[in-house]
Interface confidence: medium
C-alpha cells in the first residue's frame, strides 16, 4: 500500500492526531489535502517544521497561501521563522523576523496566543 492509499484509510481519524503522528506521516509521502489539514488540532500542527509541513502536504502545500489567515495555518505561520517560510515560495507573511530568539514560555503564549520574542 502506497502513502496516498494509506492516507485515505486513516483520513477520517486524523482530526485528533498528535504531533508525533503528523511528523511520522510527513515521512510517508501521503499528500494530505488542505481540507484535512485545516481540521487538525492547532496544538498538534504548531510544532511542525516548514519542511515537515511541505512533505506532509505534497502538492497541496501550494494552497497554504489561500489559508494563511485561517487556523491552524495562521497560528502555525506565527511560530515559524520568516526565513523558513520564505523557502516555501508562497509569499507567506507573519513569521518570526530574522535575528529574533523564540522563548518557549508556555504561560505567556497561553495568555497572548503568540510566542514570546526577544529582539536582536
Amino acid at each position: 500500500m502506497n502513502g496516498s492509499e494509506y492516507f485515505v484509510k486513516i483520513q477520517s481519524f486524523l482530526g485528533g492526531a498528535p504531533t508525533e503522528d503528523l511528523k511520522a506521516l510527513s515521512q510517508q509521502n501521503v499528500s494530505m489535502d488542505l481540507a484535512t489539514f485545516m481540521k487538525l488540532r492547532t496544538d498538534a500542527v504548531l510544532p511542525l517544521t516548514v519542511a515537515e509541513v511541505q512533505k506532509l502536504l505534497g502538492p497541496h502545500v501550494e494552497g497554504l497561501k489561500a489559508e494563511e489567515r485561517h487556523r491552524p495555518v495562521r497560528d502555525w505561520i506565527l511560530r515559524q521563522r520568516q526565513d523558513d517560510l520564505d523557502t516555501l515560495g508562497l509569499g507567506l507573511q507573519g513569521g518570526i523576523p530574522n535575528g529574533y530568539l523564540v522563548l518557549d514560555l508556555s504561560m505567556q503564549e497561553a495568555l497572548s496566543g503568540t510566542p514570546c520574542l526577544l529582539g536582536p
Partner: antibody
Framework: EVQLVQSGAEVKKPGASVKVSCKAS????????MHWVRQAPGQGLEWMGN????????NYNEKFKNRVTITVDKSASTAYMELSSLRSEDTAVYYC?????????????WGQGTLVTVSS | DIVMTQSPDSLAVSLGERATINCKAS??????IAWYQQKPGQSPKALIY???YRYSGVPDRFSGSGSGTDFTLTISSLQAEDVAVYYC?????????FGGGTKVEIK
C-alpha cells in the same frame, strides 16, 4: 492581468538539448510555483514538473527526471525548462502554468506554448 | 502514479443537448480534480476546480461533480463554441496526471 510569455519555436536534432523560457507578469512571481506541461501532436497533456521560484526547489515527473531541469531567474520573473538528450518523441508543445493563483487550485493561467520539433 | 481514465474518447451531441464526460481515478483523490477545455491551436482553459467549482467567467452550463475516484463534467446545453477536447486532471499527489481527453463534437 496575469501574463505568461514563452520563447519561440525551436527545431532541434536528436541528442541535443532545448531550453524554453516563460516570462511571468501581473502577479508576484515568487509567491506561486511554476509548472511545465507538454503536449505531443494530437496527444494529451503530460505534467513534467514544477519549480519553487523562491528557492529553486523542484519536483519532477519520474519519466523525465534525468533529462529535465526546471530553473528560475527571480530578478527577471522568468522560469526555464531545459530538456536534454532529445528524441523524436519529445516533439511537442511545451506550456508553463502557475498553480493555485488566486487561491484556486488548478492551472488557471497558461503560457501560449512553445513548439519544440526534434528532427534529424 | 495515479491514472486518470476518461470516457468516452469522443462524443457527438446535438446543439442544446446535454454532454456528459466521465473521469475515473485509479485511486482516491478526494475532490482534488480540475477540468480543462482545449480548442485546436490554443492553450488549455480551466473550467472547474475542486471537482465542482467553476472558475470565474466560465458559463454555468458547465458543471462538475464527484469525489473519490469517479468524476463527471456536464455541459447542460451544448453550444457551438463548446466544440473542443476536455481533460480532467488530479492534483492530489505527485506526479500530477491528466486524463487522455474527450473530444466533443456537434451531431
Amino acid at each position: 492581468e496575469v501574463q505568461l510569455v514563452q520563447s519561440g519555436a525551436e527545431v532541434k536534432k536528436p541528442g541535443a538539448s532545448v531550453k524554453v523560457s516563460c516570462k511571468a507578469s501581473g502577479y508576484t512571481f515568487t509567491s506561486y510555483w511554476m509548472h511545465w506541461v507538454r503536449q505531443a501532436p494530437g496527444q494529451g497533456l503530460e505534467w513534467m514538473g514544477n519549480v519553487n521560484p523562491s528557492n529553486g526547489g523542484s519536483n519532477y515527473n519520474e519519466k523525465f527526471k534525468n533529462r529535465v531541469t526546471i530553473t528560475v531567474d527571480k530578478s527577471a520573473s522568468t522560469a526555464y525548462m531545459e530538456l536534454s538528450s532529445l528524441r523524436s518523441e519529445d516533439t511537442a508543445v511545451y506550456y508553463c502554468a502557475p498553480h493555485y493563483i488566486g487561491s484556486r487550485p488548478g492551472f488557471a493561467y497558461w503560457g501560449q506554448g512553445t513548439l519544440v520539433t526534434v528532427s534529424s | 502514479d495515479i491514472v486518470m481514465t476518461q470516457s468516452p474518447d469522443s462524443l457527438a451531441v446535438s446543439l442544446g443537448e446535454r454532454a456528459t464526460i466521465n473521469c475515473k481515478a485509479s485511486q482516491n483523490v478526494g475532490t482534488n480534480i480540475a477540468w480543462y477545455q482545449q480548442k485546436p491551436g490554443q492553450s488549455p482553459k480551466a473550467l472547474i476546480y475542486s471537482a465542482s467549482y467553476r472558475y470565474s467567467g466560465v458559463p454555468d452550463r458547465f458543471s462538475g461533480s464527484g469525489s473519490g475516484t469517479d468524476f463527471t463534467l456536464t455541459i447542460s446545453s451544448l453550444q457551438a463554441e463548446d466544440v473542443a477536447v476536455y481533460y480532467c486532471q488530479q492534483y492530489n499527489s505527485y506526479p500530477l496526471t491528466f486524463g487522455g481527453g474527450t473530444k466533443v463534437e456537434i451531431k
